[in-house]
Each structure stands twice: as C-alpha cells, then as structure tokens.
C-alpha cells in the first residue's frame, strides 16, 4: 500500500538527506527530510482510520509546522488526510497534538463541508467530511 515518493513529487527531484548532512533514523522505506520522517500511504481510509494507522506506527498524521523546513511538501499532488481537525465547541482548527492552526503555516480552504482536512499542494488544506475515504500521510520526528 505504500506509495513511492517519486511519483508523489511528480517526477521533480527528491530532496535527499545526503545533501543536508545525516537525516534519520527513520523506519524502513520512510522518507527523511530535515530530521522528520514521512510516509505516504496509498490505501484509502477515513480520517479516524488513518489516524489509527499512523498511531500504530508510532507516528501521527501530517502536521505543517514550517513552510521552509517542509518545503518539499509544496510539490505534493492529490489529496491526503492530515492531522488537522475542527473543534466543534468553537469552530477553531487544531492539530492532533492540541496546538492551534496558525495561518502562516498553511492556507485552510473552508469551501467544502467537513471538520477534518486534506492536504492538497502548495501548502493548502481543504476541509472535508471525516468519513470520506482518502490516502494519508504519516509523520514522526527522527530520533
């Protein structure tokens, strides 16, 4: 079910760790970039199922924390579940770790219906029904 990184980046050159010094360690077949590990999963799941899948691999759904440090993500195509959810009580958006979305992290497009979000490309996220099926991106710190 794993998707290789090259097609996700639409045949653009993959940023490799050797150019930036050592990066890692990451689980086998995960991508290391700026000391974070990423994996793109091709299997379509609901948001909750995707979250559970990441947790089972000691990771969490994608969090955007820095456009500069996660620059390769601007090349991602298609739509993938990320770790951003709307809090029903006040309508605000926060990451899985409880931190609030800051609008310099990414553009949140709230035109579609939903209280979960998919990552598109160029640091744009789109609201979506959490029960919909999507591919997903897991992320963890390299230790």
């Amino acid at each position: 079910f794993k998707e290789t990184f090259q097609p996700v980046l639409c045949n653009k050159e993959v940023p490799v760790s050797s150019r930036e010094g050592y990066c890692g360690p990451c689980p086998n077949n995960w991508i290391c970039h700026r000391n974070n590990c990423y994996q793109f999963f091709n299997e379509e799941k609901t948001w909750n199922q995707s979250q559970a899948s990441c947790l089972s691999q000691n990771s969490s759904l994608l969090k955007i924390y820095s456009k500069e440090e996660q620059d390769f993500l601007k090349l991602v195509k298609s739509y993938h579940w990320m770790g951003l959810v709307q809090i029903p009580a006040n309508g605000s958006w926060q990451w899985e770790d409880g931190s609030s979305l800051s609008y310099n992290q990414l553009t949140l497009v709230e035109i579609p219906k939903g209280s979960c979000a998919v990552y598109g490309s160029s640091f744009k996220a789109y609201t979506e029904d959490c029960a919909n099926l999507n591919t997903y991106i897991c992320m963890k710190r390299a230790v």
Partner: antibody, heavy 116, light 111 residues
C-alpha cells in the same frame, strides 16, 4: 461589488489557439480560486480547472489536461485560459467563476466558435 | 468520482409548487455542500441556493433547498411558481478539494 468581466467572442480556425481573459474586481483576487467552466448547447456545465492566483497553483479536469492552460496576473487581477489545438468540439461558451463559501459569481461568458 | 443526476425536464403549473431533484450516484449527498444555479436562455447562471439551504440576498423566499438522505438527493423547492422561474436549473457539489461537479440540469417549463 464582485465583478468578473470576460473578453469578447472569438471566431477561430481549427488547429489554432485562443486565449480568453477574465478581469476580477470587488474582492482580493490573489486569495480566491478562479474556476473555468465549459458550456455547450444542451450539454450542461463542465468544469475545466481552477487556478489559485496567490501562488499560481492549478488543478485540471483530466479531460482538459493538455487542452487548457490556466494562468493569472495578480498585478491586473486578471485570469486567463488558453485553449490549444482547437476543433469543432471546443466550440462553446466559457465562463470564469469564483466559488466561495457563499454565493458563486459568474463572468458573462465568452462564446468561442471554431470554424474554417 | 460521483455523478449528479437531474431530470432533463419538468413541467409545472403557474402558482403551484415544484421540487427539482439532484441525486448523487455514490457516496453520501450530505458529505458535501450542494449549490443550485438558475440559468435563463443566453444568460450566465446565478446562485439560487448555496451550502444546501442558504439563499443569497435578492433571491425570493419562494426558493428553498434541502437534503433528502433517504433518496441521497438534494432538492430545490419552488413555491408559487412564476413565469419568470422558467429556466434551466443546475445543482453542483464538490468532488476533491474545491473541484466542482455539476448535474446535467433540469429545464423547468411553466404552463
């Protein structure tokens, strides 16, 4: 008041290209998606693609990939669509539209006629 | 990718109530918003209903939108139909991100 002013009707020859424009006013052009829609008589509305002028990001309906190219000029708040290798199947009215959380705004449409 | 299916044409009497349907082929109709557009011959479409049931300023309250989960359809209801309501009506929802999907349209004839 939001307005989308499109360029005039076009009569073009098969095999050629055409570039039509959509000038936006009354809102922040860079931070809104601009979509393009094709309408042929009796054929309903077909989504061609969108452009996000803020960063030039685009997405296309697979059917129009290679047929349409979307661009935008932030300085003039104008979106453009180029259609290439035109055939009679491309004869249609083309709309630019701004889809928002609220009402959708439509340009007046550009009639493109492909004829030798 | 799902399809939105609308009846090709509907006829109704002046002053009556008519319901126009928009059926989603796969997936839940409620999982994304539905917008409705009216298009008179030779004109651009205009928004009649957005986000399932909201009416833009200037649209008569004779027009209302709803979601019918049992038939997996969106409905546009027009009460007290007037001659100026004779037009084509299109429903629209979203597939991925903000990519719109349109129904084929319904031609409403007022008798």
């Amino acid at each position: 008041e939001v307005q989308l002013q499109q360029s005039g009707a076009e009569l073009v020859k098969p095999g050629s290209s055409v570039k039509i424009s959509c000038k936006a006013s009354g809102y922040t052009f860079a931070n809104n998606f601009m979509h393009w829609i094709k309408q042929q008589p009796g054929n309903g509305l077909e989504w061609i693609g969108w452009i996000y002028p803020g960063d030039g990001d685009t997405e296309y309906n697979q059917k129009f990939s290679g047929k349409a190219t979307l661009t935008a000029d932030k300085s003039s708040s104008t979106a453009y669509m180029q259609l290439n290798s035109l055939t009679s199947e491309d004869s249609a009215v083309y709309f630019c539209i701004r889809l928002t959380e609220g009402t959708t705004y439509w340009g007046q449409g550009v009639m493109v006629t492909v004829s030798s | 990718q799902f399809v939105l299916t609308q009846p090709n044409s509907v006829s109704t009497n002046l002053g009556s109530t008519v319901k126009l349907s928009c059926k989603r082929s796969t997936g839940n109709i409620g999982s994304n918003y539905v917008n409705w557009y009216q298009q008179h011959e030779g004109r651009s479409p205009t928004t009649m209903i957005y986000r399932d049931d909201k009416r833009p300023d200037g649209v008569p309250d004779r027009f209302s939108g709803s979601i019918d989960g049992s038939s997996n359809s969106a409905l546009l209801t027009i009460n007290n139909v007037q001659t100026e309501d004779e037009a084509d009506y299109f429903c629209q929802s979203y597939s991925r991100g903000v990519s719109p999907v349109f129904g084929g349209g319904t031609k409403l004839t007022v008798l």
